[in-house]
């Protein structure tokens, strides 16, 4: 629970608690913003980001964004609050322990995004269908 000597200030989004009233500690995420990437046509890639950051707010999760256009491929790694859209998209998979890339519609480029909530989970980005729980065969295995 929140220690009694830690003041609760008004509108304080820096003190976040879970359902049991325990203080929620912040996530550690890879945070290199946008970098050029060689990740292409692979089942999974490492971010090659050497910066692990303490997310500023405890509710933030790790995010990775992979983009490919005619000129280059980039990978973006950040912390972000899942209550807020990122690149105009909702972070649907924020509670996932793994960063499973999902394609989003963006004109003029190929755009994949994932979010996750385990330490440095956006270091390993996964494109492979076998990890995607929208795959009915995988759901069958899970529920058997």
């Amino acid at each position: 629970t929140i220690p009694p000597h830690v003041q609760k200030s008004v509108n304080n989004d820096m003190i976040v608690t879970d359902n049991n009233g325990a203080v929620k500690f912040p996530q550690l995420c890879k945070f290199c913003d946008v970098r050029f990437s060689t990740c292409d046509n692979q089942k999974s890639c490492m971010s090659n980001c050497s910066i692990t950051s303490i997310c500023e707010k405890p509710q933030e999760v790790c995010v990775a964004v992979w983009r490919k256009n005619d000129e280059n491929i980039t990978l973006e790694t950040v912390c972000h609050d899942p209550k807020l859209p990122y690149h105009d998209f909702i972070l649907e998979d924020a509670a996932s322990p793994k960063c499973i890339m999902k394609e989003k519609k963006k004109p003029g480029e190929t755009f994949f995004m994932c979010s996750c909530s385990s330490d440095e989970c956006n270091d390993n980005i996964i494109f492979s269908e076998e990890y995607n729980t929208s795959n009915p065969d995988l759901l069958l295995v899970i529920f058997q």
Partner: nanobody, 119 residues
């Protein structure tokens, strides 16, 4: 009984240095991540720095990177925060905290030590 006892706070001039200590007892100190967290008057918690159980991996908030250094001595059950190039905005109560881990499911907090940076 679990205890985390911070010390080393005080009044320091801008540009000065302080070293905070946090003496731990009542739990397996080397198991899990430890944090320094601060709270400026009337503000929320700011997560300053963290260190893994073995001490090899350390993490810092952007606001203190390059100025603060976290370390731990597991043989002495003590966590440290070396604070250099202190600024007025570093004024706060500094808490050490142990994050819950798989082997230790509760988090623990110290009572805090006040750091005041003023000329």
């Amino acid at each position: 009984e679990v205890q985390l006892l911070e010390s080393g706070g005080g009044l320091v001039q801008p540009g000065g240095s302080l070293r905070l200590s946090c003496a731990a007892s009542g739990f397996t100190f080397g198991d899990g991540r430890m944090w320094w967290v601060r709270q400026a008057p009337g503000k929320g918690l700011e997560w300053v720095s963290a260190i893994e159980g073995a001490g090899s991996d350390t993490y810092y908030a952007d606001s203190v990177k390059g100025r603060f250094t976290i370390s731990r001595d597991n043989s002495k059950n003590t966590l440290y925060l070396q604070m250099n190039s202190l600024r007025a905005e570093d004024t706060a109560v500094y808490y050490c905290a142990k994050q819950a881990s798989r082997n230790s499911p509760f988090d623990y907090w110290g009572q805090g030590t006040l750091v005041t940076v003023s000329s």
